[in-house]
């Protein structure tokens, strides 16, 4: 299992992971105490046939070619959590591990 | 976590799981002994903002709106394996649980 890593200077057109810092303050999300910002990353690029396919299923659907099935798209295939400190809306402050906040790898599915 | 289920008569335009039977014989894959065919399903449909989003990350990337980030796409969010009996290319026949062969749920990511 692997995926491509790119940056803003890359000329790669295929499915790739790009750096992205999410800034909660810029969103006006003041209910998040910490972190103020974090490296989230995102996926972008083209999914040519078989390139970086996560699942055998993706290949099988391409073979079967059912009505209305789009080609695979560039999407997170591995994600990880971050720890956050936040108001939970009930006047409580919670420290918790929030799943699927960081993209570690991108692929076609 | 939930997802929509549709069939060929559905008028649903949003991201949905559709039935699909994969027939290995029709593909000419004679290295697969069993099953001959199985219910794989597939995902198709539109991903309007926030609809069936699997990850908070998807929403955050939409907010941050980085260069080249496409909107979320309709993709498997829950998959399951099937047991297969197949020739492994080394004159051996193997029984194995092949992961991510069946789409159980679709969502936007």
């Amino acid at each position: 299992d692997f995926g491509l890593d790119c940056d803003e200077h890359s000329t790669e057109s295929r499915c790739c992971r790009y750096p992205l810092t999410v800034d909660f303050e810029a969103f006006g999300w003041d209910w998040i105490i910490a972190p103020k910002r974090y490296k989230a990353n995102y996926c972008s690029g083209e999914c040519e046939f078989v390139f970086l396919q996560k699942y055998p299923h993706t290949h099988l659907v391409h073979q079967a070619n059912p009505r209305g099935s789009a080609g695979p798209c560039c999407t997170p295939t591995k994600m990880s959590p971050i720890n956050m400190l936040y108001f939970n809306g009930k006047e409580q402050i919670i420290y918790g591990k929030i799943p699927a906040m960081v993209v570690d790898r991108c692929g076609c599915s | 976590d939930f997802g929509l289920d549709c069939d060929e008569h559905s008028t649903e335009s949003r991201c949905c799981r559709y039935p699909l039977t994969v027939d290995f014989e029709a593909f000419g894959w004679d290295w697969i002994i069993a099953p001959k065919r199985y219910k794989a399903n597939y995902c198709s449909g539109e991903c309007e903002f926030v609809f069936l989003q699997k990850y908070p990350h998807t929403h955050l990337v939409h907010q941050a709106n980085p260069r080249g980030s496409a909107g979320p796409c309709c993709t498997p969010t829950k998959m399951s394996p099937i047991n297969m009996l197949y020739f492994n290319g080394k004159e051996q026949i193997i029984y194995g649980k092949i992961p991510a062969m069946v789409v159980d749920r679709c969502g936007c990511s």
Partner: antibody
């Protein structure tokens, strides 16, 4: 109704050769892998060989590898087992079987006796 | 090669009895075990595949269970036509191997 009919068995001397056939009917022969399984008199079952539905892939245990060759003719709905360099320990009833996850249909078998 | 050890090698039972036959694999075979019934002078018949799936047309009194290395064939209420020899087989990886058989006889 699925039917598998083996033929070609008989008495052969050690070192000799024999070709078994299995005529299949009642199912789409070309869609299924096929196997041979044998049973020595009064003994248990032993897998001998398997061939894929299209005939591209084969598998054998070490006990027969290099001596036995499985093949098929999908146009004739027939499975074959070519047995060379036969030994006394190859004496058995040979069954052909339709293959799914397991052997789901068996023929009635043909007896091969290797003796001088 | 994977060894399949079947027990008992023979048993005597009466019509209506519950009969249990076990098979132990020498290594993990997941759920890749089949069970066959063979009567004298006849070809084996498939009863159970993938440990617990009853084959088409097999009476519901036959059931299979187990995974890993330990497997069981159970006949919930023995019928006159069930007196036969039963074999387990692993279909996990070639060379496929069979147990030595269990002969079920009339008490």
């Amino acid at each position: 109704e699925v039917q598998l009919l083996e033929s070609g068995g008989g008495l052969v001397q050690p070192g000799g050769s024999l070709r078994l056939s299995c005529a299949a009917s009642g199912f789409t022969f070309s869609s299924y892998a096929m196997s041979w399984v044998r049973q020595a008199p009064g003994k248990g079952l032993e897998w001998v060989s398997t061939i894929s539905s299209g005939g591209s892939y084969t598998s054998y245990p070490d006990s027969v590898k290099g001596r036995f060759t499985i093949s098929r003719d999908n146009s004739k709905n027939t499975l074959y087992l070519q047995m060379n360099s036969l030994r006394a320990e190859d004496t058995a009833v040979y069954y052909c079987a339709k293959q799914d996850y397991a052997f789901d249909y068996w023929g009635q078998g043909t007896l091969v006796t290797v003796s001088s | 090669d994977i060894q399949m050890t079947q027990s008992p090698s023979s048993l005597s039972a009466s019509v209506g009895d519950r009969v249990t036959i076990t098979c132990k694999a020498s290594q993990d075979v997941s759920t890749a075990v089949a069970w066959y019934q063979q009567k004298p002078g006849k070809a084996p018949k498939l009863l159970i595949y993938s440990a617990s799936y009853r084959y088409t047309g097999v009476p519901s009194r036959f059931s299979g269970s187990g995974s890993g290395t330990d497997f069981t064939l159970t006949i919930s209420s023995l019928q006159p036509e069930d007196f036969a020899t039963y074999y387990c087989q692993q279909h996990y990886s070639t060379p496929w191997t069979f147990g030595g058989g269990t002969k079920v006889e009339i008490k």
